[in-house]
């Protein structure tokens, strides 16, 4: 707000007033009269820059008159009262209402006093964020989508992630005239390491008190990545039972595990239990390559592990034994 005048009457008003599309807004405007100063106000006038004529007038004897009587109203000016408050209410804000307005007091003996106010017409956008489910492609593809619908002015969208990625942002007119829908895609080369990770879409708009943060949980569909664990290269005759685990990461989840060897079916000492393979104690050395084949909706992948059960002094090793 401009500082009060010293020794002269001054019109006080904010330089800018925000209002929301479809809502009502008050353009505040007051005449500040210093203590020792005397003034008589006979008319209050509102005019819009670039338009001919005044949109609202409050006349000392004629009262209020409006260019659009259903959309405008002096909020405080009354016949028979001192005219010090020219604040004007506008109803059903439209995009075309945005602009510069002059509030003017016709005073005696000081003359006319006026101030300009910029009316900003805003529309609060609706924001959504969604995952774009992708498969391994080897090239950058949109993995998340953030949409800010019907904002005025257009919302600002940024992405926050420690995965890298590049935004691709575009705008189209919104459903309501003068509004804008902003769509931002977050683009990255899909990999299994990205699956299940989060990225955050940050939407900023002058109608928000603080930015809106929308989290997207990324989805990458990929065939199983398979490894076998549980073998430490240190198996000896006389050991207890041991278990191998077929470790598979995939999206969607594995639908089946199949254990075999390079020679064909499993030997008797190996018993398949889903993702696990139970190795029973043996009484003679073995050297076998085991295969775990994992299937999901996108295909099958396998891992191989060569297992040796060696002879060794039982006193030094726990060994695989029948007990």
């Amino acid at each position: 707000w401009p500082p009060p005048g010293t020794g002269d009457v001054v019109v006080q008003a904010p330089t800018q007033v925000p209002g929301f599309l479809g809502d009502s807004v008050t353009l505040p405007c007051y005449l500040q009269v210093p203590n020792m100063e005397v003034t008589h106000v006979s008319q209050l006038t509102w005019a819009r820059h670039g338009e001919s004529g005044s949109m609202a007038v409050f006349h000392q004897t004629q009262g209020p008159s409006y260019s659009e009587s259903k959309r405008l109203e002096f909020v405080a000016a009354r016949l028979g009262a001192e005219l010090r408050n020219a604040s004007l209410r506008m109803f059903g804000l439209r995009v075309e209402d945005e602009g510069n307005y002059t509030c003017l007091f016709v005073t005696f003996p000081q003359g006319s006093r006026s101030v300009d106010i910029w009316l900003r017409v805003l529309a609060k956008p609706q924001n959504t964020a969604e995952v774009q489910k992708v498969q391994l492609t080897g090239e950058p593809v949109p993995m998340a989508r953030c949409v800010s619908t019907g904002g005025r002015p257009p919302a600002q969208i940024t992405w926050h992630s420690d995965l890298g990625g590049m935004p691709n942002t575009s705008q189209v007119p919104g459903f309501l005239s003068g509004t804008v829908t902003v769509t931002s895609l977050w683009i990255l080369v899909p990999s299994s390491q990205v699956d299940g990770k989060n990225v955050t879409c940050k939407v900023e708009h002058e109608s928000f008190e603080k930015p809106q943060l929308l989290t997207v949980n990324l989805t990458v569909y990929y065939p199983p990545e398979v490894s076998i664990s549980g073998y430490d290269n240190n198996w000896y005759l006389g050991q207890n039972e041991a278990t191998l685990t077929c470790d598979a990461r995939s999206n969607p989840e594995p639908t089946g595990y199949n254990w075999s060897t390079t020679m064909g079916p499993l030997p008797p000492f190996a018993v398949a239990q889903g993702a696990q393979l139970l190795i029973r104690p043996v009484d003679k050395p073995i050297n076998t390559t085991l295969i775990c084949n994992v299937t999901n909706a996108l295909g099958a992948r396998q891992a191989e592990l060569t297992v040796q059960v060696k002879e060794g002094p039982p006193s030094e090793h726990s060994g695989i034994s029948r007990n």
């Epitope: 004897t61 002059t102 005696f108 003359g111």
Partner: antibody, heavy 116, light 107 residues
């Protein structure tokens, strides 16, 4: 009904002064500024100045400053305009007019003739 | 001082005609313009304030328009009783000034 009734015609010699009255009725005198406008015969209108009855605040056209004095008598709701050092070119009809930014009510006019 | 230049200075028109009087201000006066009608032997009568708003009781055939420096008074259908002189006036700043007048005669 708002009425502004002015005093009668005046014939004055050059160098003299004239004081015209404007008695008001039908509204609250102190709520409106009173202004004075003159019109030479067959010519346009010229604003002289105005006074607010409540505060006594005045505004004058610089062309008349020093020669014109505006006063009011709140007790009788009457405004006065005195013009001194009259010259022949001051011959005109003088109007009081109630100010609402524009002038919504006017007196009937007082003809002042300055002639030697 | 702000100069208000009115045109034409005189005109004659027939009953039923559309009549337009213009007033040009030497500087921007916003919408702080009034129009007056003065019949012979009478004081001026206020018609329009704030450039485009009619005083109550003024026939709607009288229309004011404009802002800034260019203003117009239009009589949409001239009546015999509209025989008068018409003045514009600015009240944007002191000293208040009037146009020189437009004398309207009926043919």
């Amino acid at each position: 009904e708002v009425q502004l009734v002015q005093s009668g015609s005046e014939l004055k010699k050059p160098g003299a002064s004239v004081k015209i009255s404007c008695k008001t009725s039908g509204y609250t005198f102190t709520e409106y500024t009173m202004h004075w406008v003159r019109q030479p015969h067959g010519k346009g209108l010229e604003w002289i100045g105005g006074i607010h009855p409540n505060s006594g605040g005045t505004s004058y056209n610089q062309r008349f400053k020093g020669r014109v004095t505006l006063t009011v008598d709140k007790s009788t709701s009457t405004a006065y305009m005195e013009l001194s050092s009259l010259r022949s070119e001051d011959t005109a009809v003088y109007y009081c007019a109630r100010w609402t930014g524009d002038f919504d009510y006017w007196g009937q006019g007082t003809l002042v003739t300055v002639s030697s | 001082d702000i100069v208000m230049t009115q045109s034409p200075s005189a005109m004659s028109a027939s009953v039923g005609d559309r009549v337009t009087i213009t007033c040009k201000a030497s500087q921007n006066v916003g919408t702080n313009v009034a129009w007056y009608q003065q019949k012979p032997g009478q004081p001026p009568k206020a018609l329009i304030y704030s450039a485009s708003y009619r005083y109550s009781g003024v026939p709607d055939r009288f229309t004011g328009s404009g802002s800034g420096t260019d203003f117009t008074l239009t009589i949409s259908s001239l009546q015999a009783e509209d025989l008068a002189e018409y003045f514009c006036q600015q009240y944007q700043s002191y000293p208040y000034t009037f146009g020189q007048g437009t004398k309207l005669e009926i043919k």
